[in-house]
């Protein structure tokens, strides 16, 4: 049809922190590059109806639905969403195309549905249909990658059964220890599923999608190294594949490698060998031990032996269910105001945990580091010397673990005072929790040395703010002290702090704060 305009429908994803609701706009926000939604003519429909490709949006994401119309003359438009008309303000771009936009900020369930755009131009009328739905991330999964041998080839395939389809990459490193950290120059990444170069020192496969990134290291025994401080231990769940690589370098080819499980040679079909010459003409051999789906009886000591190297073993433990082993007893710490200190949790877990540190309802990222002895450790140092309760939470597919920490900061009390018609109260958050004294200031005692013991009520821990204890002391007003100045003092091993209050009328009248060290 010659009269039909050339139209283009696009989706623009925004990186904004706005919290307003959906609105029609002619000036969308700064955004990422637009995604073409196609906008094809819908067949067998009464009138001219264009249909854009379905749009899936994450909860709380912000998007713009945009239509570009290449038609002569002015256009007028109307958006309709759930039987409600929404204002529509077309404008023209530099190429003189009509531009109509619908901005949806902070996508919610209520903003999902069909958005109809009616456009009237000088030549014709037509409708554009957008279907917007919330992406169902409940169906999303990110599974740890595992290895398979490629059929008829000496190569490994990395598989991650995840939704949406993940990007798989091999992370390779040929040096030892610290220099194999993710962003080190020694690390090479290959975005492919199949790996042929299997002789490297450190081989990992990672899979990433919208849910994050998961990696699996190819478990390796290197016969040229001295043994690890702890016997290497590998945990697997029943049904998972087992892969262990044994690697050895020798001056010539005259050596062989073998795998044994509990002193019995592995059956044929459960291992394969590869060899190559390195740059200095030494021979590198690797021997893989593998079981495509482990059972309980695959548990035991796997020993790699060589005719020219000392043997080394790894303990493979097959479990029915994942686990997190750590002591969950709560721990209390007392530190000085400028003391360097980190909370730490040592744990053994399989599969690898996801974890968070929480303080005052705020979550902090959690890093974990593998130790030589098969344990992992997570440290939290970013407490900024704020006293209170800190929570470490870890979970994996099968287990959950929570540990509480209390941080107390040793400091001199700071006193706040308030008075009412019947009593005066003082509060302090110093640590260790302070003791209190009340003193009366009078002609007889201008230095406020006359101690008040009657009518004093101390509460050791009156308010617990995210684990931070506050101590208070209240003085009930009697005729004997009405109209006088009284002084409350809080003291602990780090010092004393006082506040003076006038007891003659309601309302707080503290007017002097003494800080006595």
């Amino acid at each position: 049809n010659q009269d039909l305009p050339v139209i283009k429908c696009v989706l623009i994803n925004h990186k904004n922190n706005d919290s307003s609701v959906g609105k029609s706009s002619s000036y969308p926000m700064v955004s990422e590059s637009p995604e073409d939604l196609g906008c094809a003519l819908r067949p067998q429909s009464s009138g001219t109806v264009y249909e854009a490709a379905a749009v899936e949006v994450d909860v709380s994401a912000s998007i713009t639905l945009q239509v570009l119309v290449d038609a002569p003359g002015n256009i007028s438009c109307l958006w309709v969403f759930k039987h409600s008309s929404l204002n529509c303000q077309p404008h023209f771009d530099l190429q003189n195309r009509g531009v109509v936009s619908m901005v949806i900020l902070k996508m919610t369930e209520t903003q999902a549905g069909e958005y109809l755009l009616f456009i009237q131009s000088e030549a014709t009328n037509y409708t554009i249909l957008f279907t917007v739905s919330i992406r169902n991330t409940l169906l999303y999964t990110l599974r740890r990658p595992y290895f398979r041998k490629m059929e008829n080839q000496d190569a490994l395939v990395c598989i991650s059964e995840s939704v949406p389809e993940p990007i798989v990459e091999w992370v390779l490193c040929d040096s030892q220890g610290e220099s194999c950290k993710e962003e080190s120059p020694a690390v090479v990444k290959k975005e492919e599923k199949v790996l042929h170069e299997l002789f490297g020192t450190d081989i990992r496969c990672c899979a990433r999608n919208e849910l994050g990134r998961e990696c699996t290291r190819l478990f390796t025994i290197d016969l040229n190294q001295t043994p690890q401080t702890t016997l290497p231990q590998l945990f697997l769940k029943v049904g998972e594949p087992l892969w262990i690589r044994c690697k050895a370098v020798h001056v010539n080819h005259g050596f062989g490698l073998t795998w044994e499980l509990e002193n019995k040679a592995l059956e044929e079909g459960n291992y394969f060998e590869m060899s190559t010459y390195s740059t200095n003409r030494t021979m590198i051999r690797i021997l893989f031990a593998f079981v495509s789906s482990v059972a309980r009886n695959d548990t035991g000591y796997y020993t790699c032996s060589s005719s020219k190297h000392p043997s080394q073993s790894a303990l493979v433990t097959i479990v029915e269910k994942g686990f997190i082993n750590a002591t969950n007893s709560s721990e209390d710490y007392e530190i000085d105001q400028y003391e360097e200190f980190c909370f730490s949790v040592r744990f053994k877990a399989y599969p690898q945990i996801r974890c968070t540190w929480t303080f005052s309802r705020k979550s902090f990222p959690c890093e974990q580091k593998g130790l030589d002895n098969g344990y992992s450790i997570s440290k939290f140092c970013n407490h900024k010397h704020q006293p209170g309760e800190y929570i470490f939470h870890a979970e994996n597919d099968d287990a959950q673990f929570t540990k509480m920490f209390t941080l107390n900061i040793r400091r001199k009390p700071q006193v706040l005072a308030e008075a009412s018609a019947s009593q005066a109260s003082c509060f302090s958050d110093g640590y260790p929790l302070p003791s209190w004294t009340w003193k009366k200031c009078s002609d007889k005692s201008p230095n406020c040395t006359e101690e008040i013991t009657e009518g004093v009520w101390n509460r050791k821990a009156n308010r617990k703010v995210f684990g931070q204890w506050v101590s208070s002391s209240t003085l009930n007003m009697s005729e004997a002290i009405k109209g006088f100045l009284v002084k409350c003092c809080a003291y602990n091993s780090l010092g004393t702090s006082c506040e003076t209050i006038l007891l003659n009328s309601p309302g707080p009248f503290p007017f002097i704060q003494d800080n006595i060290s």
Partner: antibody, heavy 118, light 107 residues
Framework: QVQLVQSGAEVKKPGASVKVSCKAS????????VHWVRQAPGQGLEWVGI????????SYAQKFQGRVTMTRDTSTSTVYMELSSLRSEDTAVYYC???????????WGQGTLVTVSS | DIQMTQSPSSLSASVGDRVTITCRAS??????LAWYQQKPGKAPKLLIY???SLQSGVPSRFSGSGSGTDFTLTISSLQPEDFATYYC?????????FGQGTKLEIK
């Protein structure tokens, strides 16, 4: 049969170094780690370190780090342990021991007495 | 490092007696434990490895048991040549560590 034969007794002054040898025979030298263990007079056994005769890589107890060096000569099937900056508390019998698997010491040398005295 | 504690530190017994020596690890070491016998002026000799496996050539009157943190060496019927010092050693981690020894003397 498997044998580990160590060098003879040594008397050294404080601050000096000593190098003890351990010659292996009766098995493929590069197929077993060799450990060094010492025993002070009337005391128990204390681990000093381990060497991989195939590659020459070694690992030492924290206590001896920086003072001990373990080397090997594959042509003579011999491992060496050198201890420097000697002090009187280093007086001990030093044993080399073959590692059967996972730090299991199935054969031991006869021991070398190192005496540190001024 | 893992601490190994042996008890008793010395023991008097007679030929034909059944003797038990215990060894405790400061943390779980699975079954990675060996027992050695040492006679004065001699190098130690491996008796038991992996907590309960008898080293070849060692008489069957020697036996070992235990796993985790608690281990036992048993001599079922003491012979004159068994009077010596016995050491346990963990091979779960490097550094391997030894117990302080148990001196077995003739009563």
């Amino acid at each position: 049969q498997v044998q580990l034969v160590q060098s003879g007794a040594e008397v050294k002054k404080p601050g000096a170094s000593v190098k003890v040898s351990c010659k292996a025979s009766g098995y493929t030298f590069t197929r077993h780690y060799v450990h060094w263990v010492r025993q002070a007079p009337g005391q128990g056994l204390e681990w000093v370190g381990i060497i991989n005769p195939s590659s020459g890589s070694a690992s030492y107890a924290q206590k001896f780090q920086g003072r001990v060096t373990m080397t090997r000569d594959t042509s003579t099937s011999t491992v060496y342990m050198e201890l420097s900056s000697l002090r009187s508390e280093d007086t001990a019998v030093y044993y080399c021991a073959r590692d059967r698997l996972r730090s299991r010491f199935d054969y031991w040398g006869q021991g070398t007495l190192v005496t540190v005295s001024s | 490092d893992i601490q190994m504690t042996q008890s008793p530190s010395s023991l008097s017994a007679s030929v034909g007696d059944r003797v038990t020596i215990t060894c405790r690890a400061s943390q779980s070491i699975s079954s990675s434990l060996a027992w050695y016998q040492q006679k004065p002026g001699k190098a130690p000799k491996l008796l038991i490895y992996a907590a309960s496996s008898l080293q070849s050539g060692v008489p069957s009157r020697f036996s070992g048991s235990g796993s985790g943190t608690d281990f036992t060496l048993t001599i079922s019927s003491l012979q004159p040549e068994d009077f010596a010092t016995y050491y346990c050693q963990q091979s779960y981690t490097i550094p391997p560590t030894f117990g302080q020894g148990t001196k077995l003397e003739i009563k």
